[in-house]
């Protein structure tokens, strides 16, 4: 015998109080599949969460985070604060990068400046809290007797510290 509730489409529920009639989901609730005996309460995006997609009778609301925060967890269950460039998020909030490290993003950790000398190169541009150093040609390439035909080796890509 077929379950009469299986005929109830998404956006409705099988109402046992009304002889298993398919009733529309009440306001602020939804059912995303057919044959449901109850509708689920819509997620409310409050506080630091903001609504990315409104709830409908067939799908839940979707939240993201207000400016200054970014989503974490499945379905943006948490909002984590952004930091400024030149900072990293610690357990006690945003802190400036220590000397010799940098972060060019609003997320993530401070990373060590590239050590140009490991590749036999010189520092062309000093690093800052926000930017990696830029490595220049090796000192040998700058000597008067060096061939002017051989171009200097490309600098290490910024943001990649040596392993």
């Amino acid at each position: 015998l077929q379950d009469p509730c299986s005929n109830c489409p998404a956006g409705t529920f099988c109402d046992n109080n009304r002889n298993q009639i398919c009733s529309p989901c009440p306001p602020n609730s939804f059912s995303s599949a057919g044959g449901q005996r109850t509708c689920d309460i819509c997620r409310q995006c409050k506080g630091v969460f903001r609504t990315r997609k409104e709830c409908s009778s067939t799908s839940n609301a979707e939240c993201d985070c207000t400016p200054g925060f970014h989503c974490l967890g499945a379905g943006c269950s948490m909002c984590e604060q952004d930091c400024k460039q030149g900072q990293e998020l610690t357990k006690k909030g945003c802190k400036d990068c220590c000397f010799g490290t940098f972060n060019d993003q609003k997320r993530g950790i401070c990373r060590p400046w590239t050590n140009c000398s490991l590749d036999g190169k010189s520092v062309l541009v000093n690093g800052t809290k926000e930017r990696d150093v830029v490595c220049g040609p090796s000192p040998a390439d700058l000597s008067p007797g060096a061939s002017s035909v051989t171009p200097p080796a490309p600098a290490r890509e910024p943001g990649h510290s040596p392993q």
Partner: nanobody
């Protein structure tokens, strides 16, 4: 699959107590530090407390020091947070999180897996 499942939240009056639990599975529990964080209604995530893999080292945010106690039972793969003298400002969704290393501190933000959270409401 690494999973963390919190429980123990609820409604409590100011001055009351609650004990949160976090059941872990899918990884060698004793090999990793664990952390509690919380998200108050109008704010971003706040770090609450961390404990090393062995349970020997614990760290607390200033706002909960002396009131909250973090502990773990490695034989049961469970993390705990005993919360006493609760205040209205402790109202939040509480999440347990796995850190990426065995040791921990009160600085490095090193969480890589999160639970789904349990709600704590402190109100009279």
């Amino acid at each position: 699959e690494v999973q963390l499942l919190e429980s123990g939240g609820g409604l409590v009056q100011p001055g009351g107590s609650l004990r949160l639990s976090c059941a872990a599975s899918g990884f060698t529990f004793s090999g990793y530090a664990m952390t509690w964080v919380r998200q108050p209604p109008e704010k971003g995530l706040e770090w609450v407390s961390s404990i090393s893999g062995s349970g020997n080292n614990t760290f607390y945010a200033d706002s909960v020091k002396g009131r909250f106690t973090i502990s773990r039972d490695n034989s049961k793969n469970t993390l705990y947070l005993q919360m006493n003298s609760l205040r209205a400002e402790d109202t939040a969704v509480y999440y347990c999180a796995k850190e990426g290393t065995t040791e921990t501190d009160d600085y490095h933000y090193n969480m890589d897996v999160w639970g789904q959270g349990t709600t704590v409401t402190v109100s009279s």
